[in-house]
Interface confidence: low
């Protein structure tokens, strides 16, 4: 017979010679990764016919890694579905935690072993420090010191020394976020007051008062024969500006040539989505929550 | 005044059950986190359980897990500690407290004995 | 066992100054928790003496101080007084646990 078969999971035990007598018997072993599990033969004869009788590696079976089990609060996800060596096993975390360590681990062969190539990670709670403090301001629940995933806070301005209050610029409600963060910068609490809007050959049609603060919002309308050149809605933005400017209302040119605007406004419409007031599961700012007594 | 008075407390016998109630005056108790903190008779202090300001979240010790349960009744103004399975090991004075990261506001305590 | 190790005892005479040291792990102390103190005169309820690692509560008289660094904190007492004589204990904090010292008891001799 000439040189018996060689297979992915089983080596000859001993060197291959080129040719074997009738009758003579060659052995194998499992493969350095591989572990031998009974009945099937490992050896093989070399027939009178000159093949070699039917062998196969059937019975080695690759080194496995220990099993791996969930982490709290996460989980271990087989990417090829077994543990075999050359298996990567990634781990995810729960909504609300995050990982510590290695995110991926591989079965590697060590010696004739199979062993993970590190260490399983963990799955920690996120936490948040305590959010900003603010000038003129404060926040709820000012004495908690851990914060944890999606705990929310809610600012408030305090009353202002002057006739004019605070108004609070930015989110009024911020929340713990995913990288132990929060969610929005921390809002600011000043005092925002837009100049009162006179328009010529016009005249306001809501938004009517004395004062006008923060987010304070004024419409207008030409007078006869006049037409607007600007926006016909403005609003009063945090560096105490009207945004988009105060329009003004323009002479109806007379000439044929000439054609009026027929539309009442220009430019773009700004639009103003109020801060989101509480989160779900969160006290609303209205419910004393603001105004803690002892602390 | 802000004060925390306790009530419940007495001597029950091994696998049965007690609760203890804290009625929270001069504050509102779903402003804050709220805890329950127990003494061991001539031992330290050891928490017990947790419930966040908002209800949403309750952690517990390893040795109560699963045997006690902690809730807040807002119209009452008042925490509790439902007390399952009682062990002897669970003799202690219960003390409730108001605070996130530390106490600082604690009742007098309530002495829990189990006993046969 | 507790997580935070406190000596059993610690004791001083009137007018001394006495520490009272607590010993926790990168998992609570020095995952940059803060640490916090009470006071447990005989036959009462604890007492908050120190939040925040150094912070006092109003009416903590200045003679009591915090100090934290790296996985362990400590509590000092000057100017030591016959009222101080009562069981101290740290506090800290690690995922979901509020964490005790097992308690020193402080003899003003």
């Known amino acids: 017979c000439e040189a018996p078969p060689t297979f992915e999971a089983m080596e000859l035990i001993g060197k291959p010679k080129p040719y074997y007598r009738v009758g003579e018997r060659v052995d194998y072993k499992c493969k350095k990764g591989y572990f031998y599990i009974p009945p099937l033969a490992t050896h093989t004869i070399c027939d009178r016919n000159h093949t070699w009788l039917p062998v196969s590696d059937e019975g080695c079976y690759r080194e496995m890694c220990p099993h791996i089990r969930d982490p709290l609060n996460g989980e271990a996800i087989l990417a090829n579905g077994s543990y075999e060596f050359g298996a990567e096993l990634h781990f995810i975390c729960n909504e609300g935690y995050y990982l510590i360590g290695k995110d991926i681990l591989y079965c590697e062969l060590k010696d004739t072993v199979a062993i993970w190539s590190g260490k399983p990670p963990l799955c920690e709670k996120i936490l948040c420090t305590p959010p900003p403090k603010i000038k003129n301001g404060k926040h709820t629940f000012s004495e908690v010191e851990v914060f944890e995933y999606l705990d929310a806070v809610t600012y408030s301005c305090d009353p202002a020394p002057g006739p004019d209050p605070f108004s609070l610029i930015g989110e009024s409600m911020i929340y713990c976020g995913n990288n132990s963060t929060w969610s929005h910068a921390a809002p600011e609490c000043k005092v925002v007051k837009c100049r009162f809007p006179v328009v010529e050959n016009g005249k306001q049609i809501s938004g009517f008062g004395k004062k006008f603060y923060y987010k304070a919002t004024v419409m207008f309308e030409c007078d006869k024969g006049y037409y607007l050149n600007g926006s016909d809605k403005i609003v009063c933005e945090s560096n105490s500006t009207w945004d988009p400017p105060v329009p003004k209302c323009l002479k109806v040119s007379t000439s044929p040539t000439t054609k009026s605007p027929t539309s009442s406004a220009s430019g773009p419409r700004p639009t103003y989505k109020p801060p989101v007031s509480n989160y779900p599961g969160y006290p609303k700012p209205d419910e004393g929550i603001l105004n803690n007594l002892d602390d | 005044q802000v004060q925390l008075v306790q009530s419940g407390g007495g001597v029950v016998q091994p696998g049965r059950s007690l609760r203890l109630a804290c009625a929270a005056s001069g504050f509102t108790v779903n402003n804050y986190a709220m805890h329950w903190v127990r003494q061991a008779p001539g031992k330290g202090l050891e928490w017990v359980a947790v419930?966040?300001?908002?209800?949403?979240?309750?952690y517990y010790a390893d040795s109560v897990k699963g045997r006690f349960t902690i809730s807040r009744d807002n119209s009452k103004n008042t925490l509790y500690l439902q007390m399952n399975s009682l062990r002897a090991e669970d003799t202690a004075v219960y003390y409730c407290?108001?605070?996130?990261?530390?106490?600082?506001?604690w009742g007098r305590g309530t002495l829990v004995t189990v006993s046969s | 066992q507790s997580v935070l190790t406190q000596p059993p005892s610690v004791s001083g005479a009137p007018g001394q100054r006495v520490t009272i040291s607590c010993t926790g792990s990168s998992s609570n102390i020095g995952a940059g928790y803060d640490v916090h103190w009470y006071q447990q005169l005989p036959g009462t309820a604890p007492k908050l003496l120190i939040y925040g690692n150094n912070n006092r509560p109003s009416g903590v008289p200045d003679r009591f101080s915090g100090s934290k660094s790296g996985t362990s904190a400590s509590l000092a007492i000057t100017g030591l007084q016959a009222e101080d004589e009562a069981d101290y204990y740290c506090s800290s904090y690690t995922s979901g646990t509020w964490l005790f010292g097992g308690g020193t008891k402080l003899t003003v001799l």
């Open positions: 419930i966040s300001y908002d209800g949403n979240n309750k």
């Open positions: 407290a108001k605070g996130g990261g530390y106490f600082d506001l």
